[in-house]
């Protein structure tokens, strides 16, 4: 039974100086973990893995590494130009065994469409995944194989929300002892039956995924045969009982007033830090309206910014966020209207999110200019469009067949994005890059470990 | 390389008619999609018409139909846009263009285009 209760991952997540330059506050960056969090909580909380049920994750500690770090020498993630294996080893050379789990998050460009990756886990035997602890392998270095890493940049261009929670679920799902998923079974999006291909490939798919089909943020029934073994045998080694709130870890949770760290952390005047006692932590301090860690609309000074201050850009579908001088939260912000152009023309505002294909302004659905003889390489880059239903109908935005709505301009997709039936990305060239799944992984192998740990990392 | 070149444009009274051409510099055009477009001063270049390689098929804005016909000469590798009833709203610079064999090919060859200008 005290089995059943331990439920719960506890994670460390630090972020490098590039993610920081890219979210530009602590603040965002706090909230971009947060989000990454709760996104693979609801994803694994939801998934009966062979009996085991709620799943869920909890952030133990973060390190953000700001533009001040970038020359520190203790920063391990302080290098300009690392691939992303050295990158997934620099965070494996730490001691992560007070955690279930250890990730890096960071805004690099890493070669061929590459994501994360990260260590895989297997019931027995097993070096990498979940709760693994630090030992010394054949390199003669001491690694901590309960690790991942994962970006939001690919091909010069930042992916989407939606696919980086899906990135994070995926090298976390590898953690959790599944490899990538193949078979027909479990790669529907390869089907050349209509009905079951429109639903998409699921979380473990080897290659790209849009991240708003059916299927995309769902494990295969193969991730979960393995991932249930995996989690039968290894829970019990570091899993939690979950509820309580963890002071210290950045996030204002269920109990907590605030949240600014621990002391080496906390650069806040309105909150005690972690390391305060029992009564104090996580609580405002006497006379403060509020904390930064609560939300943008909080003054360094502790108090409510007034109703006019912005705390959210303008974007693509929604308008900027407004304080409204009573909360330190950003109220939500209005949308524009559906329809409205976004993400260079390729899509279009649904419900203030930049989600629906350009076709779809015009009754039509996005299909893949994939090609099967191989002819038409070139405009597997285009955005391309069909009549519901009919695949038959599918070619570019700058076809003959859809001139009345696109006047003869070929809409290129964003570089970063699926093309090719999902089986690549775009270049910056508008080149559609088959992504090699497992290439990383056996330079990784070659490099430094001996043949017993060779099946045990993966994108 | 083929070579476009629209001519036919000038300024046309409201109400008025004008017949545009485009001369294609290759015989291949004979069975390609032909189409024209056009961009007003500050607008986004807009569809016209096309027409198929045999003439068979052809497909109109909603702007213009009833108004203009598209119609080719192959033995003189020419496009033709017969424009009546004009409208102060139909001055702009007007493209023919070239796609491939399908209606689903992309228009790859563009003329340099001719003014047309619709006094009221």
């Known amino acids: 039974t005290t089995s059943a209760e331990k439920n719960t991952c506890q994670l460390y997540i630090q972020t490098d100086h590039l993610f920081f330059k890219y979210y530009g506050t602590r603040e965002a960056v706090i909230a971009q973990i947060s989000s990454h969090v709760k996104a693979i909580d609801t994803i694994y909380q939801t998934t009966d893995f062979s009996g085991i049920r709620n799943i869920s994750f909890m952030v133990k500690r973060i390190r953000i590494n700001t533009t001040a770090d970038e020359k520190d020498p203790t920063n391990p993630f302080r290098f300009p130009n690392i691939g992303v294996e050295k990158f997934l080893e620099l965070n494996s050379e730490q001691n992560h065994d007070d955690y279930c789990l250890a990730y890096v998050f960071t805004d690099r460009d890493f070669d061929d469409g590459v994501l994360g990756l990260a260590w895989v886990g297997a019931p027995s035997g097993s070096s990498g995944g979940i709760c693994e602890k630090s030992k010394l392998y054949s390199d003669g270095k001491k690694k901590s194989l309960n690790t991942g890493i994962i970006t939001v940049q690919n091909y010069g261009s930042h992916v989407p929300p939606k696919v980086s929670h899906i990135t994070f679920a995926h090298e976390v799902g590898h953690n959790f002892g599944s490899p990538h998923d193949s078979g027909t079974e479990c790669t529907p999006g390869e089907s050349k039956n209509l009905g079951q291909k429109e639903n998409g490939n699921y979380i473990m798919y080897a290659r790209a995924t849009s991240g708003d089909k059916l299927n995309n943020n769902k494990f295969s029934l193969c991730s979960i045969r393995n991932i249930s073994q995996v989690l039968e045998k290894k829970r019990n080694n570091c899993f939690v009982e979950s509820g309580q709130p963890i002071c210290g870890n950045g996030m204002v949770e269920q109990g907590e007033e605030c949240d600014c760290g621990y002391s080496d952390q906390c650069k806040d005047e309105c909150c005690f830090d972690a390391n305060q006692p029992e009564g104090r932590k996580c609580k405002l301090k006497p006379g403060k309206q509020c904390s930064p860690s609560q939300g943008p609309c909080c003054t360094a000074q502790c108090a409510f910014k007034s109703k006019s201050e912005k705390c959210r850009d303008d974007s693509d579908c929604a308008r900027e966020g407004i304080c409204n001088g009573f909360t330190a939260l950003c109220p939500a912000s209005d949308p524009k209207p559906n329809f409205t152009d976004c993400n260079r023309h390729t899509q279009v505002c649904i419900n203030g999110q930049c989600a629906g294909s350009i076709c779809e302004k015009y009754g039509l659905e996005e299909c893949t200019c994939a090609s099967s003889d191989g002819k038409d390489d070139k405009e597997l880059c285009h955005v391309c469009c069909m009549k519901k239903m009919d695949p038959s109908t599918c070619a570019s935005t700058g076809s003959v067949q859809w001139s009345r709505h696109f006047s003869g301009r070929t809409i290129t997709l964003q570089p970063g994005s699926p093309c090719n039936d999902f089986r690549g990305y775009c270049d910056v060239f508008m080149r559609c890059r088959l992504v090699d799944a497992d290439g990383p992984l056996a330079r990784l192998k070659k490099a430094i470990f001996s043949p017993e740990l060779y099946e045990n990392i993966a994108e | 390389e083929v070579q476009l070149v629209e001519s036919g444009g000038g300024l046309v009274q409201a109400g008025g008619s004008l017949r545009l051409s485009c001369a294609a510099s290759e015989r291949i055009f004979s069975t390609y999609f032909m189409g024209w477009f056009r961009q007003a001063p500050g607008k986004e270049r807009e569809f016209v018409a096309f027409?198929?390689?045999?003439?068979?098929?052809?497909d109109y804005a909603d702007s213009v139909k009833g108004r203009f016909a598209i119609s080719r000469d192959n033995v003189k590798n020419t496009l033709y846009l017969q424009m009546s009833s004009l409208k102060p709203d139909d001055t702009a610079v007007y493209y023919c263009a070239v796609a491939g064999r399908q209606i689903k090919s992309t228009w790859g060859y563009w003329g340099q285009g001719t003014q047309v200008t619709v006094s009221s």
């Open positions: 027409i198929s390689g045999n003439g068979g098929s052809t």
